[in-house]
């Protein structure tokens, strides 16, 4: 469920709050709905990125769970095959803050469109 | 500067259709954020219309949704409201809006254009 | 009814503190966003995300949000702030956007 994966974002906005994390990650920001699987793929292996950033524990499961979260509903879809779309090294890098925005923004393209 | 103009009749007959376009001026239809229409009736609050993505998604307010159609044109880098079968409970200011992009805002609104419902 | 509620009016004097509430299970999904409206205009975003204020929106705004509930505190309220305040946020199937029914907030 796409709103359960929406969820665990906020989660993850509010502990890095109190964090620094200087990260810069792969941001996919005008998604293309024939690619938004291939996007929804990136972001996922650049969330990894904050698990390992933080070294929270509470940030790590929220991740972990979210990633299971995630793979769920994509495989719900069925197998998608996407041509044409960039490369995760393709994209933009973006701060942590900007890069949770544009993950919420996909993720919200997956609800609107279902 | 985003701006959004709405445009359209202020006056529509009962059991009629309301039709009205917002202009875009200042950005683009095409960009990544999802467009809106909100209403607010005489001295009551704000209320969900309903929204749209310029690959021509939609989503519209479950209490609207039989009477309702959003529609974009990106040559005018315009959208559009029309709503059928209009009663006096119609009768509000209309207003276009661009979603932010990621948690739920409207960062842009147009001045809002006050539609009458009467014959 | 409303997915999101909020009480209809709240008050405050001058240069006080003032905290506006916008409560709903939604709100544990998602954060909310919140707007000022004055008699004749169009609302204006005035606060979005976890605490984020569009350019040109005074810093005595803020938000913030615990469980089910969002808040909008004004610290130090100034004449200008008398407005209707609206929250806003998606409703539980995370399809539809919802706005709570606005707190006109009078400042004594």
């Known amino acids: 469920n796409w709103v359960n994966v929406i969820s665990d974002l906020k989660k993850i906005e509010d502990l890095i709050q109190s964090m620094h994390i200087d990260a810069t990650l792969y941001t996919e920001s005008d998604v293309h709905p024939s690619c938004k699987v291939t996007a929804m793929k990136c972001f996922l292996l650049e969330l990894q990125v904050i698990s390992l950033e933080s070294g929270d524990a509470s940030i790590h499961d929220t991740v972990e769970n979210l990633i299971i979260l995630a793979n769920n509903s994509l495989s719900s879809n069925g197998n998608v095959t996407e041509s044409g779309c960039k490369e995760c090294e393709e994209l933009e890098e973006k701060n942590i803050k900007e890069f949770l925005q544009s993950f919420v923004h996909i993720v919200q393209m997956f609800i609107n469109t279902s | 500067q985003v701006q959004l103009q709405e445009s359209g009749p202020g006056l529509v007959k009962p059991s009629g259709t309301l039709s009205l376009t917002c202009a875009v001026s200042?950005?683009?239809?095409?960009?990544?954020?999802?467009w809106s229409w909100v209403r607010q009736p005489p001295g009551k609050g704000l209320e969900w219309i309903g929204e749209?993505?310029?690959?021509?998604?939609?989503n519209y307010n479950p209490s609207l949704k039989s009477r309702v159609t959003i529609s974009v044109d990106k040559s005018k880098n315009q959208f559009s409201l029309k709503l059928i079968s209009v009663t006096a409970a119609d009768t509000a200011v209309y207003y276009c809006?661009?979603?932010?992009?990621?948690?739920?805002?409207?960062?842009?609104w147009g001045q809002g254009t006050l539609v009458t419902v009467s014959s | 009814s409303s997915e999101l509620t909020q009480d209809p009016a709240a008050s405050v004097a001058l240069g006080q503190t003032v905290r506006i509430t916008c409560q709903g299970d939604?709100?544990?999904?998602?954060?909310a966003s919140w707007y000022q409206q004055k008699p004749g205009q169009a609302p204006i975003l005035v606060i979005y995300?976890?605490?984020n204020r569009p350019s040109g929106i005074p810093d005595r705004f803020s938000g913030s949000s615990s469980g089910n509930t969002a808040s909008l505190t004004i610290t130090g309220a100034q004449a200008e702030d008398e407005a209707d305040y609206y929250c806003?946020?998606?409703?539980?199937?995370?399809?539809?956007?919802?706005f709570g029914g606005g707190t006109k907030l009078t400042v004594l």
């Open positions: 200042g950005g683009s239809i095409s960009s990544s954020n999802w």
């Open positions: 995300g976890k605490n």
């Open positions: 806003n946020s998606r409703d539980s199937s995370g399809k539809n956007l919802v």
């Open positions: 749209i993505y310029h690959y021509g998604y939609t």
């Open positions: 939604t709100l544990r999904n998602y954060y």
């Open positions: 809006a661009r979603e932010g992009i990621g948690w739920p805002s409207f960062d842009y």
